[in-house]
């Protein structure tokens, strides 16, 4: 897979492959994988990709299912890159406060908050 | 502050306090704090709260500015609790795949993806 493929296209293709290979992937009846109990997905990327690793090790490889796991690995790479960018730029306090305000604003309106 | 306050109310109050104390917080002209360079805030919670810690250590405490940092500390506690819930429940593969599909779907529609 060329890594030049835009991440957005990669995600779309991965969703399609996930649907295509679902029957093969669920063949292992006894396998148990940690599943987050809330929908704030970005908080759980580490656990999600650990689960993908577990699934990959239990899945017979070959054909386009390999492409699925390759895609998922590229998505992980993208997310790891995003995580690196969390602390790259050192800025004045006013800019940090604007980011913090935006973060709390998004938390206020978009997060699924269970008290 | 009673910890029984719903997290959503806590976030709202914190946004208001942040606005109230902005002038005091930005008084340190030379302080630099890492600011994430993308809008996928949940990926950066660790760095955001490290920045808050830096800011708190440089801010003269007293009055309602203390309440601001106390609130932020409770929000951190809530997020840490959410992170713990990422790997608590072990489920069958089909359930993991449902979560993965939802994660990729959200990534596809809601994340800000820069290729």
């Amino acid at each position: 897979i060329p890594t030049e493929i835009p991440t957005s296209a990669l995600v779309k293709e991965t969703l399609a492959l996930l649907s295509t290979h679902r029957t093969l992937l669920i063949a292992n009846e006894t396998l148990r994988i940690p599943v987050p109990v809330h929908k704030n997905h970005q908080l759980c990327t580490e656990e999600i990709f650990q689960g993908i690793g577990t699934l990959e090790s239990q899945t017979v490889q070959g054909g386009t299912v390999e492409r699925l796991f390759k895609n998922l690995s590229l998505i992980k790479k993208y997310i790891d890159g995003q995580k690196k960018k969390c602390g790259e730029e050192r800025r004045r306090v006013n800019q940090f406060l604007d980011y913090l305000q935006e973060f709390l604003g998004v938390m206020n309106t978009e997060w699924i908050i269970e008290s | 502050i009673p910890t029984e306050i719903p997290t959503s109310a806590l976030v709202k109050e914190t946004l208001a306090l942040l606005s109230t104390h902005r002038t005091l917080l930005i008084a340190n002209e030379t302080l630099r704090i890492p600011v994430p360079v993308h809008k996928n805030h949940q990926l950066c919670t660790e760095e955001i709260f490290q920045g808050i810690g830096t800011l708190e250590s440089q801010t003269v405490q007293g009055g309602t500015v203390e309440r601001l940092f106390k609130n932020l500390s409770l929000i951190k506690k809530y997020i840490d609790g959410q992170k713990k819930k990422c790997g608590e429940e072990r489920r069958r593969v089909n359930q993991f795949l449902d979560y993965l599909q939802e994660f990729l779907g959200v990534m596809n529609t809601e994340w800000i993806i820069e290729s």
Epitope: E89, N94, Q95, G105 | A27, T30, E114
Partner: antibody, heavy 117, light 109 residues
């Protein structure tokens, strides 16, 4: 490498609204490490800061221009804009857009706007 | 609001040292940024955070800041250094940006 490009009319009539757009390429306007700013320079004079905006929409304006200035951002187009209302000949200047981290890192080449009837 | 004062012009012979000042109330407590602007061009940062040089800016450019005055020093001045130089600070009480009026550096001869 981030590049900025101003666009808009070079001639505006007195009492009308000056409108300029800055298109950002080579980087995202949603970059949390930057504000997006407008600066102007009257002929033969120094630089005058007009205002800046954060991707979230937070704005900061020069107090002397605040009543006439609006800066907005369109993250989907990777653009930000300046509107200056009720212009007079005194608003004739070269207008620059720039990215603002701890300092002004990247600048547009500037566009001359003349206010004249 | 905060005010920065620069001399309108400074003249210096090639090879000499030029000093351009920027005055402001207790400016030493702020970070100062210096920009060079040549005719028909956008400004370019030459010194940030009082005395740090961006990549590509010659070592001949240096800065200092204390008390009520910040200074941009250009040693071994060259003809190509002829330009307008502006200082800039942040006014943290308001989150506003403030520029000095600019200084025209003329290289004699």
């Amino acid at each position: 490498q981030v590049q900025l490009q101003e666009s808009g009319p070079g001639l505006v009539k007195p009492s009308q609204t000056l409108s300029l757009t800055c298109t950002v390429s080579g980087g995202s306007i949603s970059n949390g490490g930057y504000y997006w700013s407008w600066i102007r320079q009257h002929p033969g004079k120094g630089l005058e800061w007009i205002g800046y905006i954060y991707y979230s929409g937070s704005t900061y304006y020069n107090p002397s221009l605040k009543s006439r200035v609006t800066i907005s951002v369109d993250t989907s187009k990777n653009q930000f804009s300046l509107k200056l209302s009720s212009v007079t000949a005194a608003d004739t200047a070269v207008y620059y857009c720039a990215s603002l981290g701890n300092w002004f890192d990247y600048w547009g080449q500037g566009t001359l706007v003349t206010v004249s009837s | 609001s905060y005010v920065l004062t620069q001399p309108p012009s400074v003249s210096v012979a090639p090879g000499q040292t030029a000093r351009i000042t920027c005055g402001g109330n207790n400016i030493g407590s702020k970070n100062v940024y210096w920009y060079q602007q040549k005719p028909g061009q956008a400004p370019v940062l030459v010194v940030h955070d009082d005395s740090d040089r961006p990549l590509g800016i010659p070592e001949r450019f240096s800065g200092s800041n204390s008390g009520n005055t910040a200074t941009l020093t250009i040693s071994r001045v060259e003809v190509g250094d002829e330009a307008d130089y502006s200082c800039q600070v942040w006014d943290s009480s308001s989150d506003h940006v403030v520029f000095g009026g600019g200084t025209k550096l003329t290289v004699l001869g």
